[in-house]
């Protein structure tokens, strides 16, 4: 059989080999497509079938506007003038080229050494689905799950049957490189059809800011609190991107989600101890704050925490 690829909405003509110039009863087409439950037989004498396909005087089968449901197998059987039976067999597939793909929500800036969302590539109106691929400086970017991560999503329109593809790129750029140029391309995978390419994007790569010192702020001032009171510890650090903050009590990491604020409500003596925070930077490693001593006293007498304490409000501990 012969493989035929036709564009959706365009006419398709399939010739019946061996058909006599003026077909008689000796010609028939059989179709097995998305429109037919099994094989549908068409003959020259029959009525045109739902305006979907009709046999022309020369025996060819004409589909005026092919659609997704017309994908399938088409067979013609004809008897030529010599009485010999000639068969034609076609496997028909359809395609639709989408609009030019686009990168939506493109990043204008990326930070070195940390994961950054570059953008989302969107292609609408393809059939079959096809594929999206990302490119860096004109060459394919291969997702490795670490420095280059791609999240893909394919949706099919319930009425048209056409596909929308989305591909989100996240990268971890290296420090000190040249300005990267990212683009995305859509390919249907058809022979002799070049991919459709997005406009390129060129985000700046920013070096991560080194931390400028870490402060541990404590409230109430001095770190001394009556039983049942509340202590708030705040880890303050200026760094880009913001680091992850973990907490340590008496030298042991606390099993808490990373947060710059540690709240100790309704404290008891079991909450007493030496607290510090650790900031973890992807590019600069961990950095620990000076410690603060939290004491729970019945009398509420003011004891000094490690480090210096301002006159009122928050105690400030700085490197």
């Amino acid at each position: 059989g012969q493989n035929i690829t036709a564009r959706i909405g365009e006419p398709l003509m399939l010739s019946c080999k061996g058909a006599p110039k003026k077909p008689t009863q000796k010609l028939e087409w059989k179709l097995n497509t998305g429109r037919t439950e099994a094989w549908k037989v068409l003959s020259p004498q029959g009525d045109p079938w739902d305006s979907v396909a009709r046999i022309l005087p020369n025996g060819s089968l004409l589909l005026p506007a092919i659609g997704i449901v017309d994908e399938g197998t088409f067979r013609c059987r004809a008897t030529n003038r010599l009485g010999k039976e000639v068969k034609s067999n076609y496997r028909v597939r359809v395609y639709q080229i989408p609009g030019k793909p686009e990168i939506v929500n493109p990043a204008s800036e990326l930070t070195a050494n940390v994961p950054n969302k570059v953008g989302t590539c969107v292609s609408e109106g393809s059939y079959p689905a096809g594929t999206l691929s990302w490119h860096l400086d004109g060459k394919p970017l291969i997702p490795d799950g670490k420095g280059t991560v791609v999240k893909e999503e394919t949706r099919r329109h319930p009425e048209t049957g056409l596909f929308t593809l989305r591909s989100e790129l996240t990268v971890t750029p290296a420090q000190g490189g040249t300005t990267p140029t990212y683009s995305c391309s859509f390919s249907l995978g058809l022979p002799r059809r070049r991919p459709l390419n997005t406009a390129p994007i060129q985000p700046r790569v920013r070096e991560p800011l080194p931390p400028e010192g870490i402060q541990l702020l404590v409230e109430p001032e001095g770190g001394t609190v009556a039983p049942g009171g509340t202590v708030t510890l705040t880890c303050a650090i200026s760094a880009q991107p913001p680091p992850q903050i973990h907490w340590i009590k008496d030298g042991t990491p606390l099993p808490l989600a990373p947060s710059p604020v540690l709240l100790l409500p309704e404290v008891g003596h079991e909450d007493e101890g030496i607290y510090s925070c650790v900031a973890t930077h992807p590019s600069h490693g961990p950095q620990e704050s000076p410690p603060v001593n939290i004491r729970v006293t019945e009398t509420g007498d003011e004891g000094q925490a490690a480090g210096s304490v301002d006159g009122s409000g928050l105690g400030t501990l700085a490197l």
Partner: antibody, heavy 118, light 113 residues
Framework: QVQLQQSGPELVKPGASVRISCKAS????????IHWVKQRPGQGLEWIGW????????KYNEKFKGKATLTADKSSSTAYMQLSSLTSEDSAVYFC???????????WGQGTSVTVSS | DIVMSQSPSSLAVSVGEKVTMSCKSS????????????LAWYQQKPGQSLKLLIY???TRESGVPDRFAGSGSGTDFTLTISSVKAEDLAVYYC?????????FGGGTKLEIK
């Protein structure tokens, strides 16, 4: 058919600037990169940089940063290259070329001769 | 920068002869993820601009006669003209588009005896 029509020859004085043009026809101007290439007799071909007219993003050869400035006008489907602070080293034929993504430079302009002389 | 070296710098052949010219790069032009070599060949006839003959080292541009063939991978590439015609008188350049800045070879001048 695809055509890139470049502006005519230029005779300019040292220290001056010149702007050469490359008018595209026969395709969607905003869908392809335009590259610029310098050719000096006996010096071979040097890549200057590219511009993507769709969003006027550019990429330059470090050697030509500060020397060449690439721009594009979508309404007239024309790409431009401005060369500044000209010296005799800038005397050359300059070509524009369409670049079909990673399929190389598939159509070239006829070239513009720039002569720097006092 | 990637340095492209072409040899010979010129050669003279008779019409109908087969000709080969070489292009070497200072680093690989083969991109492992898609197994494509980012190398192109161009023809420049006297007084004219350039014409793309071959891209991806071996893919002939549409409309280019099949007597032109590109081969090679990595750092060593060859352009072959199977049966030279008088109109093939030109300078042939290789160019890498693997990395910035894109660079060209010095060219091979083909003369007809």
């Amino acid at each position: 058919q695809v055509q890139l029509q470049q502006s005519g020859p230029e005779l300019v004085k040292p220290g001056a600037s010149v702007r050469i043009s490359c008018k595209a026809s026969g395709y969607t101007f905003t869908d392809y990169y335009i590259h610029w290439v310098k050719q000096r007799p006996g010096q071979g071909l040097e890549w200057i940089g590219w511009i993507y007219p769709g969003n006027v993003i550019t990429k330059y050869n470090e050697k030509f940063k500060g020397k060449a400035t690439l721009t594009a006008d979508k309404s007239s489907s024309t790409a431009y290259m401005q060369l500044s602070s000209l010296t005799s080293e800038d005397s050359a034929v300059y070509f524009c070329a369409r670049y079909d993504y990673d399929y190389a430079m598939d159509y070239w302009g006829q070239g513009t001769s720039v002569t720097v002389s006092s | 920068d990637i340095v492209m070296s072409q040899s010979p710098s010129s050669l003279a052949v008779s019409v109908g002869e087969k000709v080969t010219m070489s292009c070497k790069s200072s680093q690989t032009l083969l991109y492992s993820s898609n197994q494509k070599n980012y190398l192109a060949w161009y023809q420049q006839k006297p007084g004219q601009s350039l014409k793309l003959l071959i891209y991806w080292a071996s893919t002939r541009e549409s409309g280019v006669p099949d007597r032109f063939a590109g081969s090679g991978s990595g750092t060593d590439f060859t352009l072959t003209i199977s049966s030279v015609k008088a109109e093939d008188l030109a300078v042939y350049y290789c160019q890498q588009y693997f990395g910035y800045p894109y660079t060209f070879g010095g060219g091979t001048k083909l003369e007809i005896k």
